[in-house]
Each structure stands twice: as C-alpha cells, then as structure tokens.
Interface confidence: medium
C-alpha cells in the first residue's frame, strides 16, 4: 500500500439550510481509473462513516440513493457536498482516498474539514 | 483456498456463439477486478476483457462489440458471452482474478478453457 | 504485435545471469502504472514471478528480482537454473483503460 497527499480545507461552516461543501484534492502518483472517496465523521474520538462512493475517472460519483452526500470530480479532485446537517454533526470529516486500479493501490486521508453546523433560529409567531 | 475453473469452451463454427464461465470459490468475483485473457496455439498472452469491482467493463478493440463480460454474484462466477466467433478467436481462455483492497496484490489464474473456432 | 515489446528468445548457461527487457510508452509503462512478470511453463497457466515492478510473491526464488525506468522494466534472472527454462511474459496497464502484455520472451538454458 503506497501512501498519497490528501488535501481539504480546514474549516467550512454549513448554510443555514444544512448543507456544506468543500474540496477534497489528491496528488495521483500515477493514472488511476477507478477511484473512492470516503468520507468519515470524527468526534469525540470516534470515527464512523458518512458516505462513499467509487467512481471512474471522467465520470460523476455516483453515491447509494439514500447517502446525504452528493459529489462531482474533476481531475483530482474531488467536491462533495453534505446536506441535512443539523447543529449536532458538527465535527471534523475526514476525506479518505483510494486509488483500486489498476495497481499500485495508493491510499490517501487528509487532515479533515472542521464543519460547523449552526441550527437556525426558530422564526417568531407574528400576530396579526 | 482461492480457485477458478473455467467450463464451456469447445468447437464451434465460425459466426456461432459461445459463453465462458468462470466458477469462483474462496474470494467474491464483485469484489475483485477480473479478466478474460487468451492465448493462441503457439503464441503469446492477449487480454481480453476486464470487469471492474463497480461494474466497468473494458474489451480488447479486437473483441469489442462481439464480446461481453459480466458476473452473477449470487452464483460468484465469471461470463464471458462470445458473438460472431472467428477462426482467429481460437485460443485456450483463462480468467484471471487481480487486484486487492488493501493494497496487497492479488493475482490468480484458473487453468483455460479451450475455444477452437473451425468449419 | 504487442505494444508492448519484449525479445523473442534469450539464452544462458547454467549459473549465468540472463535480463529480459519490457519497452513500452508514456501511455503504459512510462504513465505510472505498476508491471508485472509471469513464468509459464508448457501446457500451464501463467505463474506471477515479479509483481509491482519488483516485489516478489511468496515462493519465488530471491534469484528472480524486477525494475523499473521511464518507458520500460526488465526481469533479471541469477544463478539461472534448467529448470527456468520457460515462456516470460510482462504485464502493464494502459490509459486507454486496457492490460497490456509483452510479446513473451522464450528463455533457453544451454
């Protein structure tokens, strides 16, 4: 298994509606043709997964129907967007990398992206 | 213990049919990537066709449009459907397993098949 | 014809020290992707010999070794034994999404 830079932002905070986006980049060593991005929660020393999806490169990322998360590449890199992110999710993701082939198998996991998630405020009764 | 066995080869007219199988056992096909490669009487390796773990599949532009690879993970085998076969299309067929999620390289062949494609 | 190239026959003597050439381009060998190396012996399957440009499978002699450079890799065989005596074949991958082998190279201990 051979080691590869992974980059991605360090902070992103969420809109108001939940959803954030950032930038997963990798340094390819060589010309991989099927790639997967993985991207994993971190929080309080825990680690589970979000989402992944295994991609050709060219192609769009095709994640399962029911994942929160969305994603295009392009070269190498990588935009993947979270929705419905509540205050709650706020943590670091991880972008974790795989070139599976052909081989050498290059595996790549950045730093993480700090997400904050801030709940809106509840609007107001108006009385009328 | 990884095996391959490869069944269906035989003599078949030029212009007739044929389907490959590949029977895996110790290993899931759709976790693999997985070839069809050939070789001619007296001649050397050719590839023909791969299946990737996310379900691509790429052919050889000699074999392209008549060939089709795919996998029946229920059955964990390997197909390889061969179409408007030619006498150059004689060879003996090996499906070969490789590739590996951990970075280990993963490399198994079966034992062929023989095709012989003559009127 | 292979675009990948390799010599038809090579020969040594018991002892002797035999390389195999593998050439190919920017869009195989020289792109990055890894080769490999297989032994076959008459009426059998290929048998990897060198996987990873130079890393060996366990089981194969430590007289077997790989290398790589730019557009080509080579085999290298030491203390070359009758039994060696077989069909070698390299493998690369290419970016137009295909394998790519080597013609063989016919390896003959005098």
């Known amino acids: 298994c051979k080691a590869m830079h992974v980059a991605q932002p360090a902070v992103v905070l969420a809109s108001s509606r939940g959803i954030a986006s950032f930038v997963c980049e990798y340094a390819s060593p060589g010309k991989a043709t099927e790639v997967r991005v993985t991207v994993l929660r971190q929080a309080d020393s825990q680690v589970t997964e979000v989402c992944a999806a295994t991609y050709m490169m060219g192609n769009e990322l095709t994640f399962l129907d029911d994942s929160i998360c969305t994603g295009t590449s392009s070269g190498n890199q990588v935009n993947l967007t979270i929705q419905g992110l509540r205050a709650m999710d706020t943590g670091l993701y991880i972008c974790k990398v795989e070139l599976m082939y052909p081989p050498p198998y290059y595996l790549g996991i950045g730093n993480g992206t700090q997400i904050y998630v801030i709940d809106p405020e509840p609007c107001p009764d108006s009385d009328f | 213990q990884v095996q391959l066995v490869e069944s269906g080869g035989g003599l078949i007219q030029p212009g007739g049919s044929l389907r490959l199988s590949c029977a895996a056992s110790?290993?899931?096909?759709?976790?693999?990537?997985m070839n069809w490669v050939r070789q001619a009487p007296g001649k050397g390796l050719e590839w023909v066709s791969v299946?990737?773990?996310?379900?691509?599949?790429y052919y050889a532009d000699s074999v392209k449009g008549r060939f089709t690879i795919s996998r029946d993970n229920s059955k964990n085998t390997l197909y390889l459907q061969m179409n408007s076969l030619r006498t150059e299309d004689t060879a003996v067929y090996y499906c070969?397993?490789?590739?590996?999620?951990?970075?280990?390289?993963?490399?198994?062949w079966g034992q062929g098949t023989l095709v012989t494609v003559s009127s | 014809q292979s675009v990948v190239t390799q010599p038809p026959s090579v020969s040594g003597a018991p002892g002797q020290r035999v390389t195999i050439s593998c050439t190919g381009s920017?869009?195989?060998?020289?792109?990055?992707?890894?080769v490999h190396w297989y032994q076959q012996l008459p009426g059998t399957a290929p048998k990897l010999l060198i996987y990873?440009?130079?890393n060996r499978p366990s089981g194969v002699p430590d007289r077997f070794s790989g290398s790589k450079s730019g557009t080509s890799a080579s085999l290298a065989i030491t203390g070359l034994q009758a039994e060696d005596e077989a069909d070698y074949y390299c493998?690369?991958?290419?970016?137009?999404?295909?394998?790519?082998f080597g013609g063989g190279t016919k390896l003959t201990v005098l």
């Open positions: 299946i990737y773990r996310g379900g691509s599949t």
């Open positions: 990873g440009n130079k």
């Open positions: 110790g290993f899931s096909v759709s976790n693999n990537y």
């Open positions: 070969l397993r490789e590739g590996g999620t951990s970075g280990d390289y993963v490399n198994d």
């Open positions: 920017s869009s195989n060998i020289g792109a990055g992707y890894d």
């Open positions: 493998q690369a991958y290419d970016s137009s999404l295909s394998v790519v």
